[in-house]
């Protein structure tokens, strides 16, 4: 889970060790602040949970790409 010690900076200290299906993902944001110990991706899931993930993992990159494409595709 992401942790906000001094709002508004949110940091991740641990990453999920399970792949999350893209069907369960709603959005993401990148954590690049120098105040955080590591770069991270925070996925927001369809059940409103936020999960920290390692941006170096392929499934994380693929999931971000998928969500980017979803955002770019206009809903009809």
């Amino acid at each position: 889970q992401p942790d906000a010690i001094n709002a508004p900076v949110t940091c991740c200290y641990n990453f999920t060790n399970r792949k999350i299906s893209v069907q369960r993902l709603a959005s993401y944001r990148r954590i690049t602040s120098s105040k955080c110990p590591k770069e991270a991706v925070i996925f927001k899931t369809i059940v409103a949970k936020e999960i920290c993930a390692d941006p170096k993992q392929k499934w994380v990159q693929d999931s971000m790409d998928h969500l980017d494409k979803q955002t770019q595709t206009p809903k009809t």
């Epitope: 399970r18 999350i20 299906s21 069907q23 899931t45 369809i46 059940v47």
Partner: antibody
Framework: QVELVQSGAEVKKPGSSVKVSCKAS????????ISWVRQAPGQGLEWMGA????????HYAQKFQGRVTITADESTSTAYMELSSLRSEDTAVYYC????????????WGQGTLVTVSS | DIVLTQSPATLSLSPGERATLSCRAS???????LAWYQQKPGQAPRLLIY???SRATGVPARFSGSGSGTDFTLTISSLEPEDFAVYYC?????????FGQGTKVEIK
């Protein structure tokens, strides 16, 4: 350790309703979903529906749509399954089980509640 | 709905033998969101395997899961007396989260 404790056995008349409770302890109730699964005597497992309190989602199997209602009371960490218009074929053991809404495997189960429908 | 078909319905084996149980899905179970459960008479099911191949906490190493897409397998490398039970597969990629009809592993 997570524990799910269900209400006791029930004997019901055809056409009536039954409400089974499932009280959770040892975990953050609102962070997980509760599924309901039933098992008729000598038969396999049948998924009935689920609730995810955090997201406010409820899902029902088509077979039970309109006859089953799943609710949750976060203040008491209790989930409920109400089945109406009972018939003899609804005689079964009803289980509640916890799942993580991000994934979905049922990692902790209640002990089961036997519901007997008989005139 | 995704229909799961388990085979065989019954498997008659002796302690020490290897058990191979199959679960076939009517459509692809993406990301291998498939679980295996063990159920003994009078007891609630117990989670053995999740994500097709990950062992749940406290599950002995003799249990292993494999597969992807539409074909999945649960293997018990060497049957112990306590392993004789009914085994169910379940997909949880989409609602309704359907179960297979079960495979009974009985003593030969």
């Amino acid at each position: 350790q997570v524990e799910l404790v269900q209400s006791g056995a029930e004997v019901k008349k055809p056409g009536s309703s039954v409400k089974v409770s499932c009280k959770a302890s040892g975990g953050t109730f609102s962070s997980y979903g509760i599924s309901w699964v039933r098992q008729a005597p000598g038969q396999g497992l049948e998924w009935m529906g689920a609730i995810n309190p955090l997201a406010g989602h409820t899902h029902y199997a088509q077979k039970f749509q309109g006859r089953v209602t799943i609710t949750a009371d976060e203040s008491t960490s209790t989930a409920y399954m109400e089945l109406s218009s009972l018939r003899s074929e609804d005689t079964a053991v009803y289980y509640c089980a916890r799942y993580d809404g991000i994934y979905g495997e049922l990692d902790f189960w209640g002990q089961g509640t036997l519901v007997t429908v008989s005139s | 709905d995704i229909v799961l078909t388990q085979s065989p319905a019954t498997l008659s084996l002796s302690p020490g033998e290897r058990a191979t149980l199959s679960c076939r899905a009517s459509q692809s179970v993406s990301d291998a969101y498939l679980a295996w459960y063990q159920q003994k008479p009078g007891q609630a099911p117990r989670l053995l395997i999740y994500d097709a191949s990950s062992r749940a906490t406290g599950v002995p190493a003799r249990f292993s899961g494999s597969g992807s897409g539409t074909d999945f397998t649960l293997t018990i490398s060497s049957l112990e007396p306590e392993d004789f039970a009914v085994y169910y597969c379940q997909q949880y990629i989409s609602f309704p989260a359907t179960f297979g009809q079960g495979t009974k592993v009985e003593i030969k």
